[in-house]
């Protein structure tokens, strides 16, 4: 048993039929010694008396909010949560496996630049009775500080007959140098509590591997005289690391017809302009990627040809 | 990234072209190692990230762009210098700071070159003949070192008398390639920055 936060405890249980469970001793936080009684989840049934209560925790029926009272007055509470381990594996019932980039991916994280700021998100089909808390550090043996905000519900989506809820959190490395070469990964730990169930999820990554620039900005077309060609120009996104001559981007320019089946013309360039042929009803899109370290491409920025 | 990209103008800052070739070569070599050594721990998640130049060179700090010298987090590790303008020792106006940066890059290349050559000698003794270092990568290291045009004492190639442990050698190769790729990225960024200055 360990303390998750004040008056909230997690009991780790091997989860199999007729498992012996864990013996837990609860102590009433009071100077009183006599006349103390214990109840579970505000039911009227008295579980025991005395300053301590010893319980055998085997299943969810044994978890919940234990309260000690004296003469009708509440003295203290202890909330017991269960963390299930089945066949040696901790349960992952609360979050949805996003399966990207590989199976058992529950947390996904992205950074728009090398400033040490990143966003992580996760999915669940659970709508209420759900709390998350997020901690992060650089390295685990001698951890360096990363500060995370509160997890918030960032999107709701309907998937077939079911609703899916996306939660996200923003974190910032306390002392990050954008030019640094990372040798220790960032560790992100999410504690998830659904009713009486506790689970934890972790992700480990280097900022350089989760970089996804914002799309190029100010995408413009300039027709070239007496030609079907146009000059496409754009700028680095505002959120990208500076100086741009050090943190350089490379770009992919795509001409796409109205029909998805039409052949796409693609050009790759390190410059912030390109000359392409603009077909009728087509659109021109540009996306960006770190020039030297191939992490994710940005989303497309697009303009119509007409 | 095997994609059509416009090649730089040959009249540009001389080292930029070499550094781009270096990054391409080490990335290709790392990809080849990952594929060939698929049953070895060779991915970024599996290996220990070691830097053989740690406490010997200070490339990141010595080559820090001027704009980042205001960031205290970039200055906290060592007495730091930063690069100003110049070109790859092609101009007499090369500043002292820049010379420090480029000599640090040169020392990195020399240390990796020695390590890779020693390792290749061991890999050539492997009866499985599973993997060898790409001669192109070694040649590109050499070319960039020549372009940097520093004279420094030659580091003797390490020779070992004991029987090589090929498993350990292959894991060390992965560690070395990952670290060298990260350093090659830094070198490329530095050269791009200098070229724009």
């Amino acid at each position: 048993i360990w303390e998750l936060k004040k008056d909230v405890y997690v009991v780790e249980l091997d989860w199999y039929p007729d498992a012996p469970g864990e013996m837990v001793v609860l102590t009433c936080d009071t100077p009183e010694e006599d006349g103390i009684t214990w109840t579970l989840d505000q039911s009227s049934e008295v579980l025991g008396s005395g300053k301590t209560l010893t319980i055998q925790v085997k299943e969810f029926g044994d978890a919940g909010q234990y309260t000690c009272h004296k003469g009708g007055e509440v003295l203290s509470h202890s909330l017991l949560l269960l963390h299930k381990k089945e066949d040696g594996i901790w349960s992952t019932d609360i979050l949805k496996d996003q399966k990207e980039p590989k199976n058992k991916t529950f947390l996904r994280c992205e950074a728009k630049n090398y400033s040490g700021r990143f966003t992580c998100w996760w999915l669940t089909t659970i709508s209420t009775d759900l709390t998350f808390s997020v901690k992060s550090s650089r390295g685990s043996s001698d951890p360096q500080g990363v500060t995370c905000g509160a997890a918030t519900l960032s999107a709701e989506r309907v998937r077939g007959d079911n609703k899916e809820y996306e939660y996200s959190v923003e974190c910032q490395e306390d002392s990050a140098c954008p030019a640094a070469e990372e040798s220790l990964p960032i560790e992100v730990m999410v504690d998830a509590v659904h009713k009486l169930k506790y689970e934890n999820y972790t992700s480990s990554f280097f900022i350089r591997d989760i970089i996804k620039p914002d799309p190029p900005k100010n995408l413009q077309l300039k027709p070239l005289k007496n030609s079907r060609q146009v000059e496409v120009s754009w700028e680095y996104p505002d959120t990208w690391s500076t100086p741009h001559s050090y943190f350089s981007l490379t770009f992919c320019v795509q001409v796409q017809g109205k029909s998805k089946r039409e052949k796409k013309d693609r050009v790759f360039t390190d410059k912030t302009s390109a000359t392409v042929i603009c077909r009728k009803n087509a659109s021109i899109s540009v996306r960006a990627q770190d020039r030297y370290y191939s992490s994710s491409w940005s989303e497309w920025a697009s303009v119509p040809c007409s | 990234r095997n994609l059509p990209v416009a090649t730089p103008d040959p009249g540009m800052f001389p080292c930029l072209h070499h550094s781009q070739n270096l990054l391409r070569a080490v990335s290709n070599m790392l990809q080849k190692a990952r594929q060939t050594l698929e049953f070895y721990p060779c991915t970024s998640e599996e290996i220990d990230h070691e830097d053989i130049t740690k406490d010997k060179t200070s490339t990141v700090e010595a080559c820090l762009p001027l704009e980042l010298t205001k960031n205290e987090s970039c200055l906290n590790s060592r007495e730091t210098s930063f690069i100003t303008n110049g070109s790859c020792l092609a101009s007499r106006k090369t500043s002292f700071m820049m010379a420090l940066c480029l000599s640090s890059i040169y020392e990195d290349l020399k240390m990796y070159q020695v390590e890779f050559k020693t390792m290749n000698a061991k890999l050539l003794m492997d009866p499985k003949r599973q993997i060898f270092l790409d001669q192109n990568m070694l040649a590109v290291i050499d070319e960039l070192m020549q372009a940097l045009n520093f004279n420094s004492e030659t580091v003797p190639q390490k020779s070992s008398l004991e029987e090589p442990d090929f498993y350990k050698t292959k894991i060390k190769l992965c560690i070395l390639l990952h670290a060298f790729r990260i350093r090659a990225v830094t070198i490329d960024r530095v050269m791009s920055y200098l070229n724009a200055s």
Epitope: D41, Q42, S43, S44, E59, F60, G61, A63, G64, Q65, D93, T125, I126, S127, T128, D129, D161, N162, K163, K195, L196, K197 | -
Partner: antibody, heavy 117, light 107 residues
Framework: EVQLVQSGAEVKKPGASVKVSCKAS????????IEWVRQAPGQGLEWMGG????????NYNEKFKGRVTMTTDTSTSTAYMELRSLRSDDTAVYYC??????????WGQGTTVTVSS | EIVMTQSPATLSVSPGERATLSCKAS??????VAWYQQKPGQAPRLLIY???NRYTGIPARFSGSGSGTEFTLTISSLQSEDFAVYYC?????????FGGGTKVEIK
């Protein structure tokens, strides 16, 4: 002892509104959700929504969104469910129940609402 | 929306016999399932929560099992007071949903 006591039966005309109350006692009111469940004559149970004063959250069944409002008054430990634009198929017994970790463990006695012109 | 399907709709059992009631969820609800008993003119009464935990004061002859999408309520030896309608309900994801009910009647 935990108790949920509901207001008395109501007869309403179509288009009218009804407000059912549920007075809780014997536990810390703000620690639990109050859920509302209805049962049409001879039919099964249908969940309408819930309100948690502790977290200030409401959780409505989409079917009733826009027609139902659930509130609480902590000073009297009373929960309310108002259903507007009543139709004849809203004729049912309306139950309140408390819920936290263990399902809906205590229920009110039910309030019969009849909608008839 | 998660649909809870109960079977059979009616179960005719003699007193003293075992009754097995089934409940299937249209998607996984982990073990967030409760079972209720309802007698005519009364409010439902909680029997089982978290799929297999007997609520305070519920006799040991009632037991629940299952997880994911398939759940079972078993009454090991039916007593006369057990003849009633039984509902399963998921509170894993909103909207909470009840099964259509299984009426256990005297054979």
């Amino acid at each position: 002892e935990v108790q949920l006591v509901q207001s008395g039966a109501e007869v309403k005309k179509p288009g009218a509104s009804v407000k059912v109350s549920c007075k809780a006692s014997g536990y810390t009111f703000t620690d639990y959700w109050i859920e509302w469940v209805r049962q049409a004559p001879g039919q099964g149970l249908e969940w309408m929504g819930g309100f948690s004063h502790g977290s200030g959250s409401t959780n409505y069944n989409e079917k009733f969104k826009g027609r139902v409002t659930m509130t609480t008054d902590t000073s009297t430990s009373t929960a309310y469910m108002e259903l507007r634009s009543l139709r004849s198929d809203d004729t049912a017994v309306y139950y309140c129940a408390r819920r936290r970790f263990r399902g809906m463990d205590y229920w009110g006695q039910g309030t019969t609402v009849t909608v008839s012109s | 929306e998660i649909v809870m399907t109960q079977s059979p709709a009616t179960l005719s059992v003699s007193p003293g016999e075992r009754a097995t009631l089934s409940c299937k969820a249209s998607q996984s609800v982990s073990n967030d399932v409760a079972w209720y008993q309802q007698k005519p003119g009364q409010a439902p009464r909680l029997l089982i929560y978290y799929a297999s935990n007997r609520y305070t004061g519920i006799p040991a002859r009632f037991s629940g099992s299952g997880s994911g999408t398939e759940f079972t309520l078993t009454i090991s030896s039916l007593q006369s007071e057990d003849f009633a309608v039984y509902y399963c309900q998921q509170d894993y994801s909103s909207p909470w949903s009840f099964g259509g009910g299984t009426k256990v009647e005297i054979k």
